[in-house]
């Protein structure tokens, strides 16, 4: 799978994580920090 950094407009898309652009899937993905979950790492679960 081809990945790259998210475009500038997606700054802030991931609330508690790193935004990755999955090129072949045409979508952004949030790699959440420890303790966070959700599509945009918006939920704290500890």
């Amino acid at each position: 799978v081809s990945i790259t950094k998210c475009n500038s407009d997606m700054n802030g898309y991931c609330l508690h994580g790193q935004c990755i652009y999955l090129v072949d899937m045409s979508q952004n993905y949030c790699r959440c920090e420890v303790g966070y979950t959700g599509v945009r790492c918006e939920h704290f679960y500890l």
Partner: antibody
Framework: QDQLVQSGAEVKKPGASVKVSCKAS????????IQWVRQAPGQGLEWMGR????????KYREKFEGRVTITADTSTNTAYMELSSLRSEDTAVYYC?????????WGQGTLVTVSS | DIQMTQSPSSLSASVGDRVTITCKAS??????IAWYQQKPGQAPRLLIQ???TLQPGVPSRFSGSGSGTDYTFTISSLQPEDIATYYC????????FGGGTKVEIK
């Protein structure tokens, strides 16, 4: 199946306002950004602005600042675009577009006609 | 705002011809460019995103290339069903469409 269903065609008088809705199904708008794009008859595509429904943040194209308001109601999974002080040049098809979790998934479009 | 200058605004070519459309951005858009096809009365159809990634179901005669500020969209062998208007879109910093290119059959 993911869908963006927009409200029906509108006819408005110059100076009036119009509010177009865009209801999402099959996904949560809080996971996405919702963009708005318009196309006047025989003209090109024009980006108007977008909202981050989770945070409520909006960004607008400079030429529309002060005249367009994009909002979202996460309880009904619906985004809205309101354009005020309408003029004949605002006659166009208005599209909502989902981005973020999926690149550019479009609604069916809403024709807004401005005529006296 | 980033400006996108698309050229030509229209072109006429024969079936089987190679067709090339260019878009120039007013600043580096880091390959964040998409290409759309629009036929009369229809919503735009996404063909390519991130400069060169073809969407599922899009014929391989469509391709894209470029970097920095200069990008190219190519139809390697024009088919009758390719008659449409094509738009580039930068999505690095907010969004800007190019002015469109109307492709007709000679």
């Amino acid at each position: 199946q993911d869908q963006l269903v927009q409200s029906g065609a509108e006819v408005k008088k110059p100076g009036a306002s119009v509010k177009v809705s865009c209801k999402a199904s099959g996904f949560n708008i809080k996971d996405t950004y919702i963009q708005w794009v318009r196309q006047a008859p025989g003209q090109g595509l024009e980006w108007m602005g977008r909202i981050d429904p989770l945070r409520g943040n909006t960004k607008y194209r400079e030429k529309f600042e002060g005249r367009v308001t994009i909002t979202a109601d996460t309880s009904t999974n619906t985004a809205y675009m309101e354009l005020s002080s309408l003029r004949s040049e605002d006659t166009a098809v208005y599209y909502c577009v989902r981005s973020g979790t999926l690149f550019d998934f479009w609604g069916q479009g809403t024709l807004v006609t401005v005529s006296s | 705002d980033i400006q996108m200058t698309q050229s030509p605004s229209s072109l006429s070519a024969s079936v089987g011809d190679r067709v090339t459309i260019t878009c120039k951005a007013s600043q580096d858009i880091h390959k964040y460019i998409a290409w759309y096809q629009q036929k009369p009365g229809q919503a735009p159809r996404l063909l390519i995103q991130y400069t060169s990634t073809l969407q599922p179901g899009v014929p391989s005669r469509f391709s894209g290339s470029g970097s920095g500020t200069d990008y190219t969209f190519t139809i390697s062998s024009l088919q009758p069903e390719d008659i449409a208007t094509y738009y580039c879109l930068q999505y690095d910093r907010l969004r800007t469409f190019g002015g469109g290119t109307k492709v007709e059959i000679k």
